[in-house]
C-alpha cells in the first residue's frame, strides 16, 4: 500500500507508458521538510520494483542522478510487457532498526501500439436483427486499447460505436444494436475499425458490403406437412419465412438414414410439393433460406419437423416356406411359415395375414387370418395342395404369394450332391452343393433350411431358410447363427411338383465338448457287448459332434486303452463291441469329438464279460 505520497513525489520520463524495449527514468523527490529528522545527508532514497505484488528487485545500483538527501533518479531497463510497480522508500541510515518508509510510487505500463485490425466481418441475423461486426485485433498490446467501429452508408450517414481491450476484457466484436432495413438492399456500406492506445493508433482497411452480403435470414419457422389425400408418398411442406426470401433449400431424410435428400426451391413462398416419400416412415425435414439467388448467405437450418408419413397398401411378395408331417395313413399336418415384409414393402403396420390352403382338383379351400407368421392345419394326404399368403395393413393387402405343397424330400433324383458346410466366422456358415445328377424335371429353386440341433427345436422354433436361384450352388447363412451350436442344414431342390433334399450338420465356431457321453448300461447279448449312453447335454456339446469314441482297458492295466470310433448319429445311443476277453474285468468310458478336438472322458464303468470270446 502506498500512502498518498505525503513524503514526496515520483515521476517518470518520458512517460508512464512506454514501448517494449525502451528505458525509463524514475525520479523520487522528497517534499520540503520531509526526510530523516537529524541529518538530511543521511537520507537515502531507494527504489523497489514489484511485479504482481511481489518484490523482484532493489534498484539501488541503477541511480543515474543523486541530490543527496533530496532526490534521486533511477534508470530502469528491460521491462517486461504489462504493468510494473515501482515504490520509492526513504532509508534513514543512522537508524538501523527502523524499516525504510514508503515515499511514493508509480506504475509503468509496457506495451505495443495496436496493429491494424484485420478480417472484418459483419452479419445481421434476420431482417429485423442488428448489425454485429467482428475482427482480428492482431497482437496483444498489453495496454488499454480503444476500438471504434465505423459504418458509413448512403445519404452521407455514418454510425459508430466503441469498446476497449485491457487485461480483463478483449474487444474484437461489437454489436451496433441497429438494423439495416431491406429498403437499403442495393446500397453499399463501408466499415472500418480504428484502434488507439497510448503508444499509437491504426486503422483497418475499409471493408465494403451490401445489405444482401451481410443479412443472414432467420431460419424458417412453423414447419408443417400436409399429405395429399392421406398419401404416404406425396406431401406439401409448408413454412413461414421472412418477407425478402427468394430461395429455399429443403433437406429431408428417414430418421435412421445417414444421407439427406436435398432440394432447391426458388420463390417457393413457404410451400413445396414432395413426391418421393416412403410411406409409413419417420422423416425429419429442415429448411434454410436465402435473400438473393446468387449472393448472400444461407440461414441456419430450421428446427426439425419430425413426422411419419401415412400408410399405403403393402407391396412385395412374402417369402413362404412349409413343413409337412404325416400324422397317420390319410392325414398330414402342414405348417406354413413366412417372413415379415421389410418396412419399405409393408408400408404400414401389418394387422394380419390372409392364409389360404387349396386342393387343386377338388377345389377344397381352407381360409383364415392370423397375426402370426406361421399357420398349421391338418389336411388329407391325398390331392395336390397349394398355399397362398398375403399381408394386410390399414390401407389394403399385398398380392398373395403362392407355393405348391410337395413332398420336400420325396424324390431322390432331385437331391443335391456333395453338400458341405464350412464355418466362415463367428456368425455365419457357408453351405455349398452340387446340382442333382439325374433330375427328371428342372430345378426351379433351392431352399437352404437350418435349425439348431437342440431338444424340441422342431416344435419350439420355426425353421430359418433362404431361397437360392437355380444357377447358384452356395449360400452364406447368418440369420440366428450362434457360435458353439450345431445346426441341421438341409438343401432342398424344388421343381414344379417335386422336391429332393440332402442334409448336413454345421457350426460357425466350435470347441471341444465340455464332457463325454454318460454310459448308462453295458449288456451282453450273443457274445457281444452293447454299450448304451445318454447324449451330452446340448449346451455342453459346443458345436457339431463328429463322432463318439468308446475306450476300454483291463482294470489295473497300465497299457494304452483300445478304442472304437462311431460316427455320430443323433438317433443312436448304443453300440456293440466284440473284442473283449471273457471273465476279464474291463474299465470302459466314452468321449465326444468335434472339429476342435476331443472332450474329457465321461463316466467310467466296469464290466466283466461272461460269454465265449470271439
Amino acid at each position: 500500500n502506498i500512502d498518498v505520497c505525503k513524503l514526496g513525489t515520483v515521476t517518470v520520463q518520458p512517460a508512464p507508458v512506454i514501448p517494449l524495449g525502451s528505458a525509463a527514468n524514475i525520479s523520487c523527490s522528497l517534499n520540503p521538510k520531509q526526510g530523516c529528522s537529524h541529518y538530511p545527508s543521511s537520507n537515502e532514497l531507494i527504489l523497489l520494483k514489484f511485479v504482481n505484488d511481489v518484490l523482484v528487485e532493489n534498484l539501488h545500483g541503477k541511480k543515474v542522478h543523486d541530490h543527496t538527501g533530496h532526490s534521486s533518479t533511477f534508470q530502469v531497463t528491460n521491462l517486461s510487457l504489462g504493468m510494473t510497480l515501482f515504490v520509492c522508500k526513504l532509508n534513514c541510515s543512522n537508524s538501523q532498526k527502523k524499516p525504510p518508509v514508503p515515499v511514493c510510487g508509480v506504475e509503468i505500463s509496457v506495451g505495443v501500439a495496436p496493429e491494424p485490425p484485420q478480417n472484418i466481418s459483419c452479419v445481421q441475423e434476420g431482417e429485423n436483427g442488428t448489425v454485429a461486426c467482428s475482427w482480428n485485433s492482431g497482437k496483444v498490446t498489453y495496454l488499454k486499447t480503444n476500438y471504434t467501429l465505423q459504418l458509413s452508408g448512403p445519404n452521407n450517414l455514418t454510425c459508430q460505436k466503441q469498446c476497449f481491450s485491457d487485461n480483463r476484457q478483449n474487444c474484437n466484436r461489437l454489436d451496433l444494436g441497429i438494423n439495416l432495413s431491406p429498403d437499403l438492399a442495393e446500397s453499399r456500406f463501408i466499415v472500418r475499425v480504428t484502434a488507439i492506445n497510448d503508444l499509437g493508433n491504426s486503422s483497418s482497411l475499409p471493408h465494403t458490403f451490401t445489405f444482401l452480403d451481410i443479412v443472414i435470414p432467420l431460419p424458417p419457422w412453423d414447419i408443417r406437412i400436409n399429405f395429399l389425400n392421406a398419401s404416404g408418398s406425396r406431401g406439401t411442406l409448408q413454412w413461414e419465412d421472412e418477407g425478402q426470401v427468394v430461395l429455399n433449400q429443403l433437406r429431408y431424410q428417414p430418421l435412421n438414414s445417414t444421407s439427406w435428400n436435398m432440394v432447391n426451391a426458388t420463390n417457393a413462398k413457404g410451400k413445396y410439393d414432395l413426391r418421393d416419400l416412403r410411406p409409413f416412415t419417420e422423416y425429419e425435414f429442415q429448411i434454410s433460406s436465402k435473400l438473393h439467388l446468387s449472393g448472400g448467405s444461407w440461414s441456419n437450418w430450421s428446427e426439425s419437423l419430425r413426422t411419419r408419413t401415412p400408410e399405403e397398401e403393402p407391396v412385395g411378395i412374402l417369402d413362404i416356406w412349409y413343413m409337412k408331417q404325416d400324422i397317420d395313413y390319410d392325414r398330414q399336418q402342414i405348417s406354413l411359415f413366412w417372413k415379415s415384409l421389410n418396412p419399405s414393402e409393408a408400408r404400414g403396420k401389418i394387422l394380419h395375414y390372409q392364409v389360404t390352403l387349396q386342393e387343386v382338383t377338388k377345389k377344397t379351400t381352407l381360409q383364415n387370418t392370423t397375426r402370426h407368421t406361421s399357420w398349421t392345419r391338418v389336411i388329407p394326404r391325398t390331392g395336390a395342395w397349394t398355399a397362398s399368403v398375403s399381408a394386410a395393413n390399414s390401407k389394403g393387402a399385398s398380392a398373395p404369394t403362392h407355393i405348391n405343397i410337395v413332398d420336400l424330400c420325396g424324390t431322390g433324383l432331385l437331391a443335391p450332391h456333395q453338400v458341405s458346410a464350412k464355418s466362415e466366422n463367428m456368425d455365419n456358415i457357408l453351405v455349398t452343393w452340387q446340382p442333382p445328377k439325374k433330375a427328371d424335371s428342372a430345378v426351379r429353386e433351392y431352399i437352404v433350411e437350418w435349425r439348431a440341433l437342440q431338444p424340441g427345436s422342431i416344435t419350439k422354433f420355426p425353421p430359418h431358410w433362404l431361397r437360392i436361384p437355380p444357377d447358384n450352388m452356395s449360400a452364406l447363412i447368418s440369420e440366428n447363427i450362434k457360435p458353439y451350436i450345431c445346426y441341421e442344414i438341409r438343401v432342398h431342390a424344388l421343381s414344379e411338383s417335386q422336391g429332393g433334399c440332402s442334409s448336413i450338420r454345421g457350426d460357425s465356431k466350435h470347441k471341444a465338448p465340455v464332457s463325454g457321453p454318460h454310459i448308462t448300461a453295458i449288456t451282453e447279448k450273443k457274445e457281444r457287448l452293447f454299450i448304451s449312453w445318454t447324449h451330452i447335454p446340448f449346451p455342453e456339446q459346443r458345436g457339431c459332434i463328429l463322432h463318439y469314441r468308446i475306450y476300454w482297458k483291463e482294470r489295473d492295466s497300465t497299457a494304452q486303452p483300445e478304442l472304437c470310433e462311431i460316427q455320430y448319429r443323433r438317433s443312436q445311443n448304443s453300440h456293440p463291441i466284440s473284442s473283449l476277453q471273457p471273465r476279464v474285468t474291463y474299465v470302459l468310458w466314452m468321449t465326444a469329438v468335434t472339429a476342435a478336438g476331443e472332450s474329457p472322458q465321461g463316466n467310467e464303468r466296469e464290466f466283466c464279460p461272461q460269454g465265449k470270446a470271439n
Epitope: 429485423n128 442488428t130 448489425v131 459504418l151 452508408g153 448512403p154 445519404n155 450517414l157 454510425c159 459508430q160 460505436k161 454489436d175 451496433l176 444494436g177 441497429i178 438494423n179 439495416l180 432495413s181 429498403d183 437499403l184
Partner: nanobody
Framework: QVQLQESGGGSVQAGGSLRLSCAVS????????MGWFRQAPGKEREFVVA???????VYTNSVKGRITISRDNAKNAVYLQMNALKPEDTAVYYC???????????????????WGQGTQVTVSS
C-alpha cells in the same frame, strides 16, 4: 406526459464551442433513440446526430469530428457538444426522441415521436 427541453444555445464566434442540453421527463432516455436536428433560416429541418438505445452514434458526415452526442442516464438528459463552429451551423437546434432501431431511421424526422421546442444557436464570423 413526455417533455423535452433544450437549453445552452446562444451566440458564439466562429471557431468557438457550445454545449446544448436536452432534459427529458416522462420517459427514460436510455430506452429510446435520442436525436438532434437543426433548422437554418429559410431551410428545411435537417438531421445532425443521434444515439441509439444501444449507445451507437449516427451522424451526418458534414459534422464529423466537430460534434459529439452524449447521454447521462442518471440525469435523464442528452447533450450535444459542438466545437469549431462555423457560420453555417447557425440554426434552431431540436432534441428528439423515438423507439428507432434502423440505421436510416435514426436520421428520419418522421420516426421520432417526441420533440423539444428548440434552442437558437448563432455563429458569427
Amino acid at each position: 406526459q413526455v417533455q423535452l427541453q433544450e437549453s445552452g444555445g446562444g451566440s458564439v464566434q466562429a471557431g468557438g464551442s457550445l454545449r446544448l442540453s436536452c432534459a427529458v421527463s416522462g420517459r427514460t432516455v436510455s430506452d429510446y433513440a435520442m436525436g438532434w436536428f437543426r433548422q437554418a433560416p429559410g431551410k428545411e429541418r435537417e438531421f445532425v446526430v443521434a444515439m441509439s438505445s444501444s449507445e451507437t452514434t449516427v451522424y451526418t458526415n458534414s459534422v464529423k469530428g466537430r460534434i459529439t452526442i452524449s447521454r447521462d442516464n442518471a440525469k435523464n438528459a442528452v447533450y450535444l457538444q459542438m466545437n469549431a463552429l462555423k457560420p453555417e451551423d447557425t440554426a434552431v437546434y431540436y432534441c428528439s426522441m423515438g423507439p428507432i432501431t434502423t440505421f436510416q431511421g435514426l436520421a428520419r424526422q418522421n420516426e421520432y415521436h417526441y420533440w423539444g421546442q428548440g434552442t437558437q444557436v448563432t455563429v458569427s464570423s
